[in-house]
Interface confidence: medium
Amino acid sequence: LQEKIEEIAAKYKHLVVKKCCYDGVRINHDETCEQRAARISVGPRCVKAFTECCVVASQLRANNSHKDLQLGR
């Protein structure tokens, strides 16, 4: 799981955008990926990175019985 996320995050070279990806990866079932992404005001590149990483991480967890995937700062 972590390898796959790192692979996706590596696409984002800008540190701010990369952080947006990691923010999306963090487990948060208070709202869906789309709902959370809609609240981001940093900019469209951040929204795109957040959404892609959030959805991929959620799908990976769904295929792995939702084991925790806590990626760092």
Partner: antibody, heavy 119, light 112 residues
């Protein structure tokens, strides 16, 4: 191990105000949404509201029954979330729980604090 | 708001026998990220609610394997394969697919 500890409950007259606090520990507080849920005596739980983490704006959302009267705030430097309750009504009498989806999936609940609104 | 309809509201069970609780939502709780946004909680007398099942079918850490959750979309079920005396309390489902989160009415499980 994550822990949520509420404080500030008590007896207040209708129309009065009260501020509840929730001290969190055992997780990276600033990364997570924080919520309040209440439970009136003999009833089921009722969602009160939430405050989002800064990554998605730190905004708040409330149940229709408390909107305009209750305010949720957070202080990430103190790992604390607050519920300011104004214009309290007798129907606000309940045990108030601080809850979060930090740590394990699903909601983790504090021990709860009783708020009694009565004259 | 999404309405959660839980049944039965009262459930008398003989120890060792199975038990089943249903929760039906007025809208689908399955999001495009593949997750069913529903939890099951047990509130024992005088205690805070405790998580049993998340995501519709994932057993929380420390929860005995006699508890299981199933379903997707709008219909969900919590099953206890063999009820024990310590299982008494009120069981709630909770949807968090959309704000505001909404709870089922609760099912009071009691031992016959």
């Amino acid at each position: 191990e994550m822990q949520l500890v509420e404080s500030g409950g008590g007896l207040v007259q209708p129309g009065g105000s009260l501020r509840l606090s929730c001290a969190a520990s055992g997780f990276t507080f600033s990364d997570y949404y924080m919520q309040w849920v209440r439970q009136a005596p003999g009833k089921g739980p009722e969602w009160v509201g939430l405050i989002r983490n800064k990554a998605v704006g730190g905004t708040t959302q409330y149940a229709a029954s408390v909107k305009g009267r209750f305010t949720i705030s957070r202080d990430d430097s103190k790992n604390s979330v607050y519920l300011q309750m104004n214009s309290l009504k007798t129907e606000d009498t309940a045990v108030y729980y601080c809850v979060s989806r930090a740590g394990p999936p699903g909601l983790s609940w504090g021990q709860g604090v009783l708020v009694t609104v009565s004259s | 708001d999404i309405v959660m309809t839980q049944s039965p509201l009262s459930l008398p069970v003989t120890p060792g026998e199975p038990a089943s609780i249903s929760c039906r939502s007025s809208q689908s709780l399955l999001a495009s990220d593949g997750y069913n946004y529903i939890d099951w909680y047990l509130q024992k007398p005088g205690q805070s609610p405790q998580l049993l099942i998340y995501g519709g079918s994932n057993r929380a850490s420390g929860v005995p394997d006699r508890f299981s959750g199933s379903g997707s979309g709008t219909d969900f079920t919590l099953k206890i394969s063999r009820v024990e005396a310590e299982d008494v309390g009120v069981y709630f489902c909770l949807q968090h697919r959309a704000l505001p989160p909404t709870f089922g009415q609760g099912t009071k499980l009691e031992i016959k």
